[in-house]
């Protein structure tokens, strides 16, 4: 009998992206940042 | 979250094709991995494997009915087809489609409820 | 083809017994992955068969603790240690290593 074929395929897990600015004063220009999952990564 | 449904044509004529179409949602057939089934059960009886079709199109089919069936999909209308010829009264059954678990862990995690096909001699 | 063997075919219990299924294949089922490519799935009358094991002893998500899968090789065991009635209804092992993939003839679990 021939092997069955098993990938390693991935599971996609659908997560939120939240890109935001944050303005911390005239001096100090802006923090751009990336939250995925509730999570600040950049 | 993950479904699947079969449809087909209830009743058919012996000698003719038998034509199922599997629709589902949840899951995309061109993800890497990816994989659907077709299975049937004669009522009262055990269950058969026929045939799969993976995520890039290569196919896998019960050697006993290959000559007899032909597996496809359309991954943009999220369908996949299953088509026998010839068929008879024995071909009378309960015809599911599964998806099968992502990756090495294998497993049909996923069934649709099942569609009667009834063979007319 | 792999044929699965399962005994008994018909395992009458009571509730809150513990049961115990064998399921035999013809030839080795170790992929050459290195996976054993053995599950367990429950059918329930009227309804679609439900995935329980997959690779010989891993519960799939939402199966209770009480349903334990185990075995090697050509050898294969589903063990269930308090029966419920929900549990009842037939069992089938399956082989998803070699080409056709292939089911057990099924256990129907049922009451004394």
């Known amino acids: 009998d021939a092997e069955f074929r098993h990938d390693s395929g991935y599971e996609v897990h659908h997560q939120k992206l939240v890109f935001f600015a944050e303005d911390v004063g005239s001096n100090k220009g802006a923090i751009i940042g990336l939250m995925v999952g509730g999570v600040v990564i950049a | 979250q993950v479904t699947l449904k079969e449809s087909g044509p209830g009743i058919l004529q012996s000698s003719q094709t038998l034509s199922l179409t599997c629709s589902f949602s949840?899951?995309?057939?061109?993800?890497?991995?990816?994989?659907v089934s077709w299975i049937r059960q004669p009522s009262g009886k055990g269950l058969e494997w026929l045939a799969h079709?993976?995520?890039?199109?290569?196919?896998r089919y019960n050697p006993s009915l290959k000559s007899r069936l032909t597996i496809s999909k359309d991954t943009s209308r999220n369908q996949v087809f299953l088509k026998i010829t010839s068929v008879d009264t024995a071909d009378t059954a309960t015809y599911y489609c599964?998806?099968?678990?992502?990756?090495?862990?294998?497993?049909?995690?996923?069934w649709g409820q099942g569609t009667l096909v009834t063979v007319s001699a | 083809d792999v044929l699965m063997t399962q005994t008994p075919l018909s395992l009458p219990v009571s509730l809150g017994d513990q049961a115990s299924i064998s399921c035999r294949s013809s030839?080795?089922?170790?992929?050459?992955?290195?996976?054993?490519?053995l599950e367990w799935y429950l059918q329930k009358p009227g309804q679609s068969p439900k995935l329980l094991i997959y690779k010989v002893s891993n519960r799939f998500s939402g199966v209770p603790d009480r349903f334990s899968g185990s075995g090697s090789g050509t050898d294969f065991t589903l063990k269930i240690s308090r029966v419920e009635a929900e549990d009842l209804g037939v069992y089938y092992c399956f082989q998803g290593s070699h080409v056709p993939l292939t089911f057990g003839a099924g256990t129907k679990l049922e009451l004394k």
């Open positions: 599964a998806r099968r678990r992502n990756g090495y862990d294998g497993g049909f995690a996923y």
């Open positions: 079709i993976y995520w890039d199109d290569d196919k």
């Open positions: 949840g899951f995309s057939l061109s993800t890497s991995g990816m994989g």
């Open positions: 030839q080795s089922i170790v992929h050459s992955n290195g996976n054993t490519y």
